[in-house]
């Protein structure tokens, strides 16, 4: 069974908590 591995960049810009809806989806699309 395939395993999904999430690779993250430590320097990736975080998403402001208020930019998320209650289901955890980000409201905006752009990074900067």
């Amino acid at each position: 069974e395939p395993v999904v591995v999430h690779i993250t960049d430590d320097n990736e810009e975080p998403i402001a908590p208020y930019h998320f809806d209650l289901s955890g989806h980000a409201f905006g699309a752009m990074a900067c």
Epitope: E13, P14, I15, A16, P17, Y18, G28, A29
Partner: antibody
């Protein structure tokens, strides 16, 4: 170039209304949260309101709730701030700002001045 | 609401000095802390976002550090164009709030 330009400021009497506009250029406006930030003469910065990219979520500072309304027209790359029941303490330079995904204000307009006085 | 307290409110320094400005949040804001520079009659300019990330085009003499409640903006070698007012801002929760500002003046 990528920019924001506010307009609509002016002199208004206490209790009056004013609508500010912010025109966005050279970026995909409908991908960004947008904010209004104000600065009273000789004072610091105060966030006023912001709006989700599709306009469905809006937040306000307590001091303007029920009096100010933020809105946007993505088809016209424009942000608005309708200000009603204006008070002397609303006198300030009003800036529109584009938010980064972290909530930082990465792009600012030059500001428009609102003076509330009789 | 989250209160942001900046110190000092003003400071005098000379060209070439190392300058440190601090910002304290009334509760933990993780790394959601941003720094701005403002000159008289101009709009603020973003210097540092997410506590330590340098905004594109900002000189590397500016740096930010901290997380949780305590944060620092450092200018490693003050230049003539750096005399201005500096503000911190939290973007952890609405209402978004700013510190009261730090005016950096010429000694």
């Amino acid at each position: 170039q990528v920019q924001l330009q506010e307009s609509g400021g002016g002199l208004v009497q206490p209790g009056g209304s004013l609508k500010l506009s912010c025109a966005a250029s050279e970026f995909t406006f409908n991908n960004y949260w947008m904010s209004w930030v104000r600065q009273a003469p000789g004072k610091g910065l105060e966030w006023v309101a912001n709006i989700k990219p599709d306009g469905s979520v809006k937040y306000y500072v307590d001091s303007v709730k029920g009096r100010f309304t933020i809105s946007r027209d993505n088809a016209k790359n424009s942000l608005f701030l309708q200000m009603n029941s204006l008070r002397a303490e609303d006198t300030a330079v009003y800036f529109c700002a584009r938010e980064r995904q972290s909530g930082a204000f990465g792009l600012w307009g030059q500001g428009t001045t609102v003076t509330v006085s009789s | 609401d989250i209160q942001m307290t900046q110190s000092p409110s003003s400071l005098s320094a000379s060209v070439g000095d190392r300058v440190t400005i601090t910002c304290r949040a009334s509760q933990s804001i993780s790394s959601y802390l941003n720094w701005y520079q403002q000159k008289p009659g101009k709009a603020p300019k973003l210097l540092i976002y997410a506590a330590s990330s340098l905004q594109s085009g900002v000189p590397s003499r500016f740096s930010g550090s901290g997380s949780g409640t305590d944060f620092t903006l450092t200018i490693s070698s003050l230049q003539p164009e750096d005399f201005a007012t500096y503000y911190c801002q939290q973007s952890y929760s609405t209402p978004l709030t700013f510190g009261g500002g730090t005016k950096v003046e010429i000694k």
